[in-house]
């Protein structure tokens, strides 16, 4: 069985950011500044054709 | 310092995991200096087609 | 039409170094990855690692890493590799193979092979 | 590191025999997987890859299946030319690895 669709699980460390509990809740600016520029980022890295997208982000302290 | 865990999905054959990986560590300066953001500690891993399945079941 | 061309065939004593190159011609040198297979004699093929030119980032299996170097002159459309330390085990044909563009994964365009052969 | 298991390691056929070889990843390699043929003396060509796309020029009587962690090569109905040995190759994660091989021979 196949989906047409390959998933990979990234996980990485922003060690110049502070984790905070606003990062638990993503109606906050601080939660929705940072996902946004995660996923610009991404679309930036990834701009080759077969990139469909990002989901599943979680903030958890280092 | 913040971890960051997401889920990554791309066209099935159009990119091997080796190259997520590489690709998204050679952009590490860029985003450091477009973004703020200091990268370390980068992990890839295929998701097995399961869990795959559930999550584009949304 | 894409041509790799590799030096010639190279004699070296225990402990000595060697450079390897691949001339390539026929396409846009920076835009492919070179990787570099090594093949025994009578043994199967072993990847060694790559080089991508247009960057200079490399890739090594981890067997090679204090084995081998890979370098790029870009305008010399030219990929290199030496070899340190050279013993015996080392001696073997060695293959630099063009890796295609965006999404393929496989070595599409082969050098003809260099063989290197140590002894004293 | 992902090991490529290939079987045989020779195989003797007779001409027009349907032949099959296969390859067994020690892991899930995504269809990231690669043939060639290496005739004696020469450099390795490629034949198939994303484990079932025949390569230009190769003749329609080689073919690439499997999924997940094992593919096999199949050449329908064997001629002396296929005289050779037959590489997979690993191309999701590396170090890219290759099967040990399989020389073919004619009866």
């Known amino acids: 069985l196949s989906t047409g669709v390959s998933f990979f699980f990234l996980s990485f460390h922003i060690s110049n950011l502070q984790f905070n509990s606003s990062l638990e809740d993503p109606s906050t600016d601080y939660y929705q500044e940072l996902q946004r520029d995660i996923s610009e980022m991404f679309l930036q890295i990834y701009k080759q054709g077969g990139f469909l997208g990002l989901s599943n982000i979680k903030f958890r302290p280092g | 310092s913040v971890v960051v865990q997401l889920t990554l999905a791309f066209r099935e054959g159009t990119i091997n995991v080796h190259d997520v990986e590489t690709q998204f560590n050679q952009y590490k300066t860029e985003a450091a200096s477009r973004y703020n953001l200091t990268i370390s500690d980068v992990s890839v891993s295929d998701v097995p087609f399961p869990f795959s399945a559930q999550s584009g079941a949304g | 039409q894409v041509q790799l061309v590799q030096s010639g065939a190279e004699v070296k004593k225990p402990g000595a170094s060697v450079k390897v190159s691949c001339k390539a011609s026929?396409?846009?040198?920076?835009?492919?990855?070179m990787h570099w297979i090594k093949q025994a004699p009578g043994q199967g093929l072993e990847w060694m690692g790559y080089?991508?030119?247009?960057?200079?980032?490399?890739h090594y299996n981890q067997k090679f890493k204090d084995k081998a170097t890979l370098t790029a002159d870009k305008s010399a459309s030219t990929a290199y590799m030496e070899l340190y330390s050279l013993r015996s085990e080392d001696t073997a044909v060695y293959y630099c193979?063009?890796?295609?563009?965006?999404?393929?994964?496989?070595?599409?365009?082969w050098g003809q092979g260099t063989l290197v052969t140590v002894s004293s | 590191d992902i090991q490529m298991t290939q079987s045989p390691s020779s195989l003797s056929a007779s001409v027009g025999d349907r032949v099959t070889i296969t390859c067994r990843a020690s892991?899930?390699?995504?269809?990231?997987l690669v043939w060639y043929q290496q005739k004696p003396g020469k450099s390795p060509k490629l034949l198939v890859y994303?484990?079932?796309t025949l390569t230009d020029g190769v003749p329609s009587r080689f073919s690439g299946s499997g999924s997940g962690t094992q593919y096999s090569l199949t050449i329908s109905s064997l001629q002396p030319e296929d005289v050779a040995t037959y590489y997979c190759?690993?191309?999701?994660?590396?170090?890219?690895?290759f099967g040990s091989g399989t020389k073919l021979e004619i009866k």
């Open positions: 994303n484990a079932k």
């Open positions: 193979a063009r890796q295609g563009n965006y999404a393929a994964y496989y070595f599409d365009y």
């Open positions: 190759q690993n191309f999701w994660n590396v170090p890219f690895t």
């Open positions: 892991g899930n390699i995504h269809n990231f």
């Open positions: 080089i991508n030119p247009g960057s200079d980032y490399t």
């Open positions: 026929g396409y846009t040198f920076t835009t492919y990855t």
